[in-house]
Amino acid sequence: EVEKTACPSGKKAREIDESLIFYKKWELEACVDAALLATQMDRVNAIPFTYEQLDVLKHKLDELYPQGYPESVIQHLGYLFLKMSPEDIRKWNVTSLETLKALLEVNKGHEMSPQVATLIDRFVKGRGQLDKDTLDTLTAFYPGYLCSLSPEELSSVPPSSIWAVRPQDLDTCDPRQLDVLYPKARLAFQNMNGSEYFVKIQSFLGGAPTEDLKALSQQNVSMDLATFMKLRTDAVLPLTVAEVQKLLGPHVEGLKAEERHRPVRDWILRQRQDDLDTLGLGLQG
């Protein structure tokens, strides 16, 4: 807490500029008007303030806005955002995607901090759902963002937002998350033709039920083994040898290399040996 002291003569700040970097902490406290700071927040980022000086500026804004900063200030926080605590951020009402982008830019290249997580949570709750533009923005900054959400949170993602999802955004999703995302993806891509559909739905197939895998086998998709290995075991088990053969196409030979790993291992054990033999791969049930 900075002590309240009078501003020395001639030091009263008329604007936020580089001269302030030479002010001691107590001088900043005494000589910079909080309202002036709020209106000229966009200049703060251009000035190489020390962390201690930024603490003082934050303190001034906290005093001016005890109920939480207005969006006009939040949008221009820049590096001052790094000084905010999750408790500070919970008081904010961020509605503009531009504001969100500006703050995410500050944290770019770092792991998602508790502050960023709180900011995103506030923003999404304010919007009511995770719309396409928001998802686009979030996954651009944090490819693993989608997989950090709980299945309950993912349920608020509208199917239209799924178009923004890239394969790498789903790399760390677990089966429970894909169970929620897959039906949305199926709905989002339903009007695409066979081959285009498969390209789009492929990353989500870890949430696909048996019936949909059987249906995919009718579309000449030639699923690769890497995708097949990510399918739900309970969805793969009821597939017949002929269906797996049609689903994998020329990649069916790859089953041999994966015969000891799930879901291939469990699927093999469920098949009749006579049926497995027709693949000519030497698979033993």
Partner: antibody, heavy 117, light 107 residues
């Protein structure tokens, strides 16, 4: 032993409707896609419709699309084919067949549908 | 749609003969080619699937070969119960289509 028994065939006027049924036994019906294949008198085989194991997906050739509807009731182990706007060229023996990936592996004995005025 | 053309349309043969039926697809169907046998007044029965795999219970005198667009069904030694009509069917691409059939008659 896989058994498929069709019923519901008969004589119907052009423009009329008919519903065929196929009772399945000897296998887990809800695990398999099912199909209808027809054969006009003295002619070859023509695939008519296929339905996914849960009933979500249906497939038809252009010749019957919009007129025929395949459906199933897994609780009754029964497959159906609703045929509307029937034409003389729909006259055929209609076979119910189990469909496995790309193979019609088991067939019923067929039911004759005659479309004539 | 993929057209399936069988030849010959019919053939006459004697018991013990080696019989060959061919089936040509209008485009590449990989190995998704099946053969069915149908006797008069009866339902078709699956004989061979995926070009050369024998369905359960089918005698080993039946065999299949080919890939891409050209396929063959061979009966190594014709038996009395083999006189029937044989159909090929492609399972590569919807709509699934059948050949027009080859009738094997007694000479």
């Amino acid at each position: 032993e896989v058994q498929l028994v069709e019923s519901g065939g008969g004589l119907v006027q052009p423009g009329g409707s008919l519903r065929l049924s196929c009772a399945a036994s000897g296998f887990t019906f809800s695990d398999y896609f099912m199909s209808w294949v027809r054969q006009a008198p003295g002619k070859g085989l023509e695939w008519v419709a296929t339905i996914s194991n849960g009933g979500t997906y249906t497939y038809y050739p252009d010749s019957v699309k919009g007129r025929f509807t395949i459906s199933r009731d897994n609780s009754k182990n029964t497959l159906y084919l609703q045929m509307n706007s029937l034409r003389a060229e729909d006259t055929a023996v209609y076979y119910c067949a189990r469909f496995d990936g790309y193979i019609f592996d088991y067939w019923g004995q067929g039911t004759l549908v005659t479309v004539s005025s | 749609d993929i057209q399936m053309t069988q030849s010959p349309s019919s053939l006459s043969a004697s018991v013990g003969d080696r019989v060959t039926i061919t089936c040509r697809a209008s485009q590449d169907i990989s190995s998704y080619l099946n053969w069915y046998q149908q006797k008069p007044g009866k339902a078709p029965k699956l004989l061979i699937y995926y070009t050369s795999r024998l369905h359960s219970g089918v005698p080993s005198r039946f065999s299949g070969s080919g890939s891409g667009t050209d396929f063959t069904l061979t009966i190594s030694s014709l038996q009395p119960e083999d006189f029937a009509t044989y159909y090929c069917q492609q399972g590569n691409t919807l709509p699934y289509t059948f050949g027009q059939g080859t009738k094997v008659e007694i000479k």
